[in-house]
Amino acid sequence: SGTTNTVAAYNLTWKSTNFKTILEWEPKPVNQVYTVQISTKSGDWKSKCFYTTDTECDLTDEIVKDVKQTYLARVFSYPAGNVESTGSAGEPLYENSPEFTPYLETNLGQPTIQSFEQVGTKVNVTVEDERTLVRRNNTFLSLRDVFGKDLIYTLYYWKSSSSGKKTAKTNTNEFLIDVDKGENYCFSVQAVIPSRTVNRKSTDSPVECMGQEKGEFREI
């Protein structure tokens, strides 16, 4: 039959960061291939990654159509290659993925400090507003465009000469903090979605310190 010597996929796992979304599974195929289908709860099953020997399928193009929908995928196994097979009776084996809601579950990518500028005892720190693969009117939206006020950034900052960290929060992409005159500070930021139950925080950005090229220092 058509399912001769095929094994069902297992360990179906969503890997998603800033909406770039890939479904991964096991095992590596031996004399079989896979086709993936994706659907919303109320929608049709759309085939992607036809007859592939890969164990991953990029589903970004589908999930960015509506990141607030809940998606389900399934992976079909078909016999292939130089195997004994006498027709395709029955349906291929398949396995379902866990449900995935991009807006609630995509990992927040590591943020980047775009710039900082000191004016007297104030420093303005700006976080880069990373572009996502979500589109509206043929334009790629930024992380802030997608999440709006659901997304906040936490700034960690400390004097270069000490280890005591302070924090600040913003629901924009800018911080304005008070600093001691004549001191150099280091900064790191983290993206956070407080309303989430999973994947609430990104990893910390690379550390940027005053006195390096990224910042601008103006003593008034």
């Epitope: 058509g2 291939v33 049709d44 099953w45 085939s47 036809f50 290659g81 349906e91 291929p92």
Partner: antibody, heavy 118, light 106 residues
């Protein structure tokens, strides 16, 4: 069972357009990719493009880019292939075909003969 | 695009004989598909994913190959097998078909 029934033969003038239809039955129309393939007289087969009726997602062979439009009407379970700026080289039998078990060209319509002649 | 070259273009054989049709790809492909076509009819899926017989295809047919060289073999020709056979790949866009091998009665 899956059935794809295409519109009848067409005779067209060079420079004009043709729109071929493919009415599907026996399955959920919006759930499967539909492809269009053509075959010139005595020649091999050539993929034109495809559509996923569920969301209108479509892709085209670059050789036809700008001249072909594939659409689908979910209310009538019908796919359409429109080809413009016809020349005599576009004289062919045009087939619609649907994905299926183990094959993207698993089910075929009966074909529509398009003749381009002045 | 991937060019598929089928050989021979024409085979003249008698019922009961063995036929081997070849399909050569201009670059390596993962799998090959084969279709049977008879005059005034649409192509029919015949072999898929290199070696899987489509539903209803007799066991005297088989498919083999990998990389750039693929073949369809009919172990013992019967009257209904005389037709044109096309190979097809979709490892790369666009999907392409071979020019066909016509198997005719000698």
């Amino acid at each position: 069972q899956v059935q794809l029934v295409q519109s009848g033969a067409e005779v067209k003038r060079p420079g004009s357009s043709v729109k071929v239809s493919c009415k599907a039955s026996g399955y959920t129309f919006s759930s499967y990719w539909m492809y269009w393939v053509r075959q010139a007289p005595g020649q091999g087969l050539e993929w034109i493009g495809q559509i996923y009726p569920g969301d209108g997602d479509s892709n085209y062979n670059e050789n036809f880019q700008g001249r072909v439009t594939i659409t689908a009407d979910k209310s009538t379970s019908t796919a359409y292939m429109e080809l413009s700026s016809l020349t005599s080289e576009d004289s062919a039998v045009y087939f619609c075909t649907r994905e299926g078990y183990g094959n993207r060209f698993a089910y075929w319509g009966q074909g529509t003969l398009v003749t381009v002649s002045s | 695009e991937i060019v598929l070259t089928q050989s021979p273009a024409l085979m003249s054989l008698s019922p009961g004989e063995r036929a081997t049709l070849s399909c050569s790809a201009s670059s390596s492909v993962s799998y090959m598909y084969w279709y049977q076509q008879k005059p005034r009819s649409a192509p029919r899926p015949w072999i898929q994913l290199t070696s899987n017989l489509a539903s209803g295809v007799p066991a005297r047919f088989s498919g083999r190959g990998s990389g750039t060289d693929f073949s369809l073999t009919i172990s013992s020709l019967e009257a209904e097998d005389f037709a044109t056979y096309y190979c097809q790949q979709w490892s790369y866009n666009p999907p392409t078909f071979g020019g066909g091998t016509k198997v005719e009665i000698k």
